[in-house]
C-alpha cells in the first residue's frame, strides 16, 4: 500500500509553544515487514516511536527551531518510498495593544494597532485591519514592522497599522475594534480588541459598555490549533463563550459554548446568508448549528453571543472546493 | 480554472499617471491575497505591493510608496494598482498574481500575462 | 530588508545532467522561501513553496531543502523544458524579496 501520512497535507503549521504529532504509516504487500522511520532535514526532529508499520513524531512545546522539512521515509523489503511534510511554527499569542486606549469621539483622529510577538509577518499571512460597526476601514496610513526585543533563542515581531478615522461624533459612535489575523495552511485565527470611543473627555465609558478597558474577542477557523490564552490572568477576566467545529453528515456542526458555571445562554447572532438558512438548537451554555457542504458551503462569519455578559465568538469559514451539485 | 488578466499599461510621460486592472475568474477574490510584481526590462522580479483578502491590509516596497496604491472591487473580482508621480525606473511589466485561498504564505500560485508599462518622454 | 542572493548567476549544462541552485537570506527566514521559473516572455510559474513542498503539477524532478538563511533547488536529471530562470523568494517578513535569478543555459 501507499505511504500515509496523518495529516496528509505537505505543510502542517503548529503554534510557537504548542504540540503537533506527525504520524507515518506504512503497509506491505505478502505480508513483509515494513520499516517505516522519521527523518529530520535541516531541523530538530522532536521525539520519535516507531514500531514495525509506522512512525509518530511528536512536537512538543514547539519553538521556531522545529520548523523545517521532515521526511517519512518507509520501505518494504527492496522497495522505498518518501513523503515529505514541511512543518511551520507561527506565534500569534492574543496580545493586541491599541493607541489610544480609548477614544475621545471629536477629538482623536488617529488610531494604532499592535500584534506583538508574532511571526512570520509576511502581509499574506498577518493582516491588520481596524472595524467601525461592521464596516472595514480602508487602507492605513502607515504600517511597520520592527523585532520584539528578543527573549531566548526565538525572533518574534511586532506589526503595526495607523489609520486616520472619519468623524466619530454621533450621538451613538459604531463600535470601533483592531483585528488581527493569521493566516497560514490549515489555519485561520483572529483577535479582536474593542477601542471605546468616548463622547467627551468627562463621559468616562462609552455608551452600551461597562468598561473602557478594551476587551479581546477571539476567533479561529480551519484550524486544529487551540489559540494561546490571552496573557496575564485568565481567571479575572470575564468568561468567554468558544466556537468548536466537528465534521457532521453532510456538512460540519458548530458548537458554541461557554463553560461558565450556572445562570448562562449562548445563541447564534450570525451566519453567512443570515440565520435561518441554518438548522439551529440551543440548550443554555450550548448552542449547535449545522452547516451544509453543499457546493461551495457557506463562507464568512459565523458568531454566537453570551448572555448575560455580552461576549462574542466569531469564526470565519472559508468555502471548500467547490462540489458540482448533485443531479436532480 | 483561475485566470488573471491585467490592463492599462502603455506610454506615459515622466511625471504622469495611469491605472493597471486586473481581472479574476475561477478564484475565491475577496479570500484572496493578491500582489503587484514587475520586471524591468532584462532583468530580476521585484514585489511592489500586496492586499489582504479584504483589502484592509495593504503593503508597499518603499520605491513606490506614497505614489503607487493598490486597492480591489470585490463585485468586479478586480484588482488596482494606481500608479502616479511616474519615474523612468517605473518602466517594467507589471504582473498580477494571487494565491490560493487556504495558504497563508504559499507563494503567488496564480499570475497573469503581465502587461507594460513604459514611462518616457 | 532581507536580501536575497542567488548562486550561480547563470550556469550551462546538458540534459540528464543533476543541477543545483543555492539561495542564501542576509537573515534567518525559517521555511519562508519559494522557487519560481519563468521563461523568456512567460510568467513566472511556482515551483516549490516553503522550502520543500512541490507545487501540483510539477515534476518530482525538482527538490528543495534548507532552513533558516541556506536553501537549495536540486533539478535531478535536467530536460529539455527546464532551462529558464530560476528565482527564490522569502516572504517571511515585509518588504517580500526575490534574489536576481539563475539563469540555466543548454550547454
Known amino acids: 500500500g501507499p505511504l500515509e501520512v496523518e495529516p496528509p497535507d505537505s505543510v502542517v503549521a503548529v503554534s510557537m509553544g504548542g504540540s503537533r504529532q506527525l504520524t507515518c504509516r506504512l503497509s506491505c504487500a505478502d505480508h513483509r515487514a515494513p520499516s517505516v522511520q522519521w527523518r529530520g532535514l535541516d531541523t530538530s526532529l522532536g521525539a520519535v516511536r516507531s514500531d514495525a508499520g509506522s512512525s509518530v513524531l511528536s512536537v512538543h512545546n514547539a519553538s521556531l527551531s522545529a520548523a523545517g522539512t521532515h521526511v517519512c521515509v518507509g520501505s518494504c523489503g527492496n522497495l522505498t518510498l518518501q513523503r515529505t511534510v514541511q512543518l511551520l511554527v507561527f506565534a500569534f499569542p492574543d496580545q493586541l495593544t491599541v493607541s489610544p486606549v480609548a477614544l475621545v469621539a471629536k477629538q482623536d483622529r488617529e488610531v494604532a494597532c499592535t500584534a506583538h510577538n508574532v511571526t512570520p509577518a509576511s502581509p499574506e499571512a498577518l493582516s491588520l485591519s481596524l472595524l467601525l460597526g461592521d464596516r472595514e476601514l480602508g487602507e492605513a496610513l502607515s504600517r511597520e514592522v520592527e523585532e520584539e526585543p528578543q527573549q531566548g533563542e526565538d525572533l518574534l515581531f511586532q506589526v503595526t497599522g495607523r489609520w486616520l478615522l472619519p468623524s466619530l461624533d454621533t450621538p451613538t459612535p459604531p463600535a470601533l475594534h483592531c483585528r488581527a489575523t493569521m493566516t497560514l495552511p490549515g489555519v485561520q485565527l483572529s483577535h479582536q480588541r474593542a477601542i471605546p470611543v468616548l463622547r467627551s473627555l468627562t463621559s468616562r465609558e462609552p455608551p452600551g459598555t461597562t468598561s473602557p478597558e478594551a476587551t479581546p474577542e477571539l476567533s479561529s477557523t480551519r484550524s486544529s490549533e487551540s489559540p494561546a490564552p490571552p496573557a496575564g490572568n485568565s481567571s479575572a477576566r470575564p468568561c468567554r463563550p468558544k466556537i468548536h467545529q466537528s465534521p457532521a453528515a453532510g456538512g460540519l456542526e458548530l458548537l458554541c459554548e461557554a463553560a461558565c458555571g450556572p445562570g448562562v445562554a449562548v445563541g447564534w447572532t450570525q451566519a453567512p446568508g443570515g440565520l435561518e438558512a441554518y438548522q439551529r438548537r440551543e440548550a443554555g451554555a450550548q448552542a449547535w448549528l449545522s452547516v451544509p457542504r453543499a457546493g461551495c458551503g457557506p463562507e464568512g462569519w459565523f458568531q454566537c453571543r453570551l448572555d448575560p455578559g455580552g461576549q462574542m465568538a466569531s469564526l470565519y469559514l472559508v468555502a471548500e472546493v467547490c462540489s458540482p451539485p448533485a443531479p436532480p | 480554472e483561475v485566470q488573471l488578466l491585467e490592463s492599462g499599461g502603455g506610454l506615459v510621460q515622466p511625471g504622469g499617471s495611469l491605472r493597471l486592472s486586473c481581472a479574476a475568474s475561477?478564484?475565491?477574490?475577496?479570500?484572496?491575497?493578491m500582489t503587484w510584481v514587475r520586471q524591468a526590462p532584462g532583468k530580476g522580479l521585484e514585489w511592489v505591493s500586496t492586499?489582504?483578502?479584504?483589502?484592509?491590509?495593504?503593503y508597499y516596497a518603499d520605491s513606490v510608496k506614497g505614489r503607487f496604491t493598490i486597492s480591489r472591487d470585490s463585485p468586479k473580482n478586480t484588482l488596482y494598482l494606481q500608479m502616479n508621480s511616474l519615474r523612468a525606473e517605473d518602466t517594467a511589466v507589471y504582473y498580477c498574481?494571487?494565491?490560493?485561498?487556504?495558504?497563508?504564505?504559499?507563494?503567488?500560485?496564480?499570475w497573469g500575462q503581465g502587461t507594460l508599462v513604459t514611462v518616457s518622454s | 530588508d532581507i536580501q536575497m542572493t542567488q548562486s550561480p548567476s547563470s550556469l550551462s549544462a546538458s540534459v540528464g545532467d543533476r543541477v543545483t541552485i543555492t539561495c542564501r537570506a542576509s537573515r534567518s527566514i525559517s521555511s519562508y522561501l519559494n522557487w519560481y521559473q519563468q521563461k523568456p516572455g512567460k510568467a513566472p510559474k511556482v515551483l516549490i513553496f516553503?522550502?520543500?513542498s512541490l507545487q501540483s503539477g510539477v515534476p518530482s524532478r525538482f527538490s528543495g531543502s534548507g532552513s533558516g538563511t541556506d536553501f537549495t533547488l536540486t533539478i535531478s536529471s535536467l530536460q529539455p523544458e527546464d532551462f529558464a530562470t530560476y528565482y527564490c523568494?522569502?516572504?517571511?517578513?515585509?518588504?517580500?524579496?526575490f534574489g536576481q535569478g539563475t539563469r540555466l543555459e543548454i550547454r
Open positions: 516553503f522550502v520543500s
Open positions: 475561477g478564484l475565491t477574490f475577496n479570500n484572496s491575497a
Open positions: 492586499t489582504s483578502g479584504s483589502g484592509g491590509t495593504t
Open positions: 523568494q522569502q516572504n517571511y517578513i515585509p518588504p517580500i524579496t
Open positions: 498574481a494571487a494565491r490560493g485561498y487556504s495558504y497563508g504564505t504559499t507563494p503567488y500560485e496564480y
